[in-house]
C-alpha cells in the first residue's frame, strides 16, 4: 500500500509522526553501523538522539541481522551493482520505486531499502563525497514517508519488523 | 482541524513576478510532502511543483522549471511558490496540496498574468 | 515523465447508473495512484488513494482498483451529488502527473 492520506490520530506507535521519527532513528543506526563494520569510519549523522528504550534497540538488532542476511542475497547484490552514481537522485528513486514495482510490501524489503541506502552511503564515504550521505538518509525518508507509512501503519508499526523476522527472503 | 490557506494571487504584467503563501495548520509541514497545482480557466488539473521534508527535495512541472521556485518555512508552517518571469499561459488558480496522495488542498489562489 | 491516459474524456449517466473510469499509466507506477473528485469553483476532493484505498469519508459506493499499469474508479450506483470531473494521479516519485480528466454529467 503506497501512500499518504493516513487516517490514524497522532500519538502511539502508529502515528505517522511516530513511524517517521523511529524510522529516521532506525535508518541512522543502521547505516552507522554497517558503514563502520565496513568502511571503518562512523559517519556523523545525528537528526537527533535516538531513545535508548529496548523496543527500539530490539529493532536495531533485528535490522542489523536482516542486513547481514541481505550480504548474501546476489539478486540484490547485483541491483546495487548496477547503479550508476552520476545521477544519484534519480537512480535512488529509480531502484527504490522497482523494489516495491509489483505493489507488494513485506517488511524484508523495507529494509532492502535501508540497505540500498547504506550501500549508496559506502559509496559516497569511498569516493569522499560525505555531504551526499545526509541526503541520501532525507531521499530514503522521503520515500518511506510517501510510499510505505500507510502499510507500516497498517503493519502496526516498526513493531511488526520484530514478528517478521526469520523470513529470510526480502523478495 | 487540517487547513492550508493560500494568499498571494492577483494581477501581474506578463514578465512579473509573484508569491504564493500557503499557510498550514492543524498539522505540521516538517512531516510531509508539500505540493502545487494549478487549474487553469475552463481547463484539468496540472501540477506545478513538489517540495519533500526530508532530503528537501524539490520538483517542477518542465512549463515552470527556472521560472519558479517552491520552498518551505517549517518555522512559520508555511509552503511559497515563488513564481518569475510570468506568462499569460500561467493564468490559473493555483491550490497548495498536503502529501503525495493530495488528502488536504487549499481554496485556491487566482493568478492573472495579463497586459 | 509517466503519462496518466484517462478515458472516457465525458459521460452521461443517470442516477442509479453503475460508471467505470479509468486511467492507464505510460509505465509502472505499483499502486501509487489517486482519484479526486472535483465539482465547479471547489478545489479537488481524494477520494481514493493507493489504487484502492477509500479515504476517509467517501462514501463506499466509490471504489477504486489496479491491474498492471491499469487503474479504475468505479461508481457502483450514481447519486445526484456525483454528478461532477474526476482526476487520476500517479505519485509514483519525482513529478506527479493527472489524467485529462473525465466529467460525469446528467443523462
Known amino acids: 500500500m503506497d501512500g499518504s492520506g493516513e487516517q490514524l490520530g497522532s500519538g502511539g506507535p502508529t502515528s505517522s509522526e511516530q513511524i517517521m521519527k523511529t524510522g529516521a532513528f532506525l535508518l541512522q543506526g543502521f547505516i552507522q553501523d554497517r558503514a563502520g563494520r565496513m568502511a571503518g569510519e562512523t559517519p556523523e549523522l545525528t537528526l537527533e538522539q535516538p531513545p535508548q528504550d529496548a523496543s527500539t534497540k530490539k529493532l536495531s538488532e533485528c535490522l542489523r541481522r536482516i542486513g547481514d542476511e541481505l550480504d548474501s542475497n546476489m539478486e540484490l547484490q547485483r541491483m546495487i551493482a548496477d547503479v550508476d552514481t552520476d545521477s544519484p537522485r534519480e537512480v535512488f528513486f529509480r531502484v527504490a520505486a522497482d523494489m516495491f514495482a509489483d505493489g507488494n510490501f513485506n517488511w524484508g524489503r523495507v529494509v532492502a531499502l535501508f540497505y540500498f541506502a547504506s550501500k549508496l552511503v559506502l559509496k559516497a564515504l569511498c569516493t569522499k563525497v560525505p555531504e551526499l550521505i545526509r541526503t541520501i538518509m532525507g531521499w530514503t525518508l522521503d520515500f518511506l514517508r510517501e510510499r510505505l507509512l500507510v502499510w507500516i501503519q497498517d503493519q502496526g508499526g516498526w513493531e511488526g519488523l520484530l514478528s517478521y523476522f526469520g523470513t529470510p527472503t526480502w523478495q | 482541524e487540517v487547513q492550508l490557506v493560500e494568499s498571494g494571487g492577483g494581477l501581474v504584467q506578463p514578465g512579473g513576478s509573484l508569491r504564493l503563501s500557503c499557510a498550514a495548520s492543524g498539522f505540521n509541514i516538517s512531516y510531509y510532502s508539500m505540493h502545487w497545482v494549478r487549474q487553469a480557466p475552463g481547463k484539468g488539473l496540472e501540477w506545478v511543483a513538489s517540495i519533500y521534508p526530508y532530503s528537501s527535495s524539490t520538483y517542477y512541472a518542465d512549463s515552470v522549471k527556472g521560472r519558479f521556485t517552491i520552498s518551505a518555512d517549517t518555522s512559520k508552517n508555511t509552503a511559497y511558490l515563488q513564481m518569475n518571469s510570468l506568462r499569460a499561459e500561467d493564468t490559473a488558480v493555483y491550490y497548495c496540496?498536503?502529501?503525495?496522495?493530495?488528502?488536504?488542498w487549499g481554496q485556491g489562489t487566482l493568478v492573472t498574468v495579463s497586459s | 515523465d509517466i503519462q496518466m491516459t484517462q478515458s472516457p474524456s465525458s459521460l452521461s449517466a443517470s442516477v442509479g447508473d453503475r460508471v467505470t473510469i479509468t486511467c492507464r499509466a505510460s509505465q509502472s507506477v505499483s499502486s501509487a495512484v489517486a482519484w479526486y473528485q472535483q465539482k465547479p469553483g471547489k478545489a479537488p476532493k481524494l477520494l481514493i488513494y493507493?489504487?484502492?484505498s477509500l479515504y476517509s469519508g467517501v462514501p463506499s459506493r466509490f471504489s477504486g482498483s489496479r491491474s498492471g499499469t491499469d487503474f479504475t474508479l468505479t461508481i457502483s450506483s450514481l447519486q445526484p451529488e456525483d454528478f461532477a470531473t474526476y482526476y487520476c494521479q500517479q505519485w509514483s516519485f519525482g513529478p506527479i502527473t493527472f489524467g485529462q480528466g473525465t466529467k460525469v454529467e446528467i443523462k
Open positions: 493507493s489504487a484502492s
Open positions: 496540496a498536503r502529501s503525495s496522495a493530495m488528502d488536504y
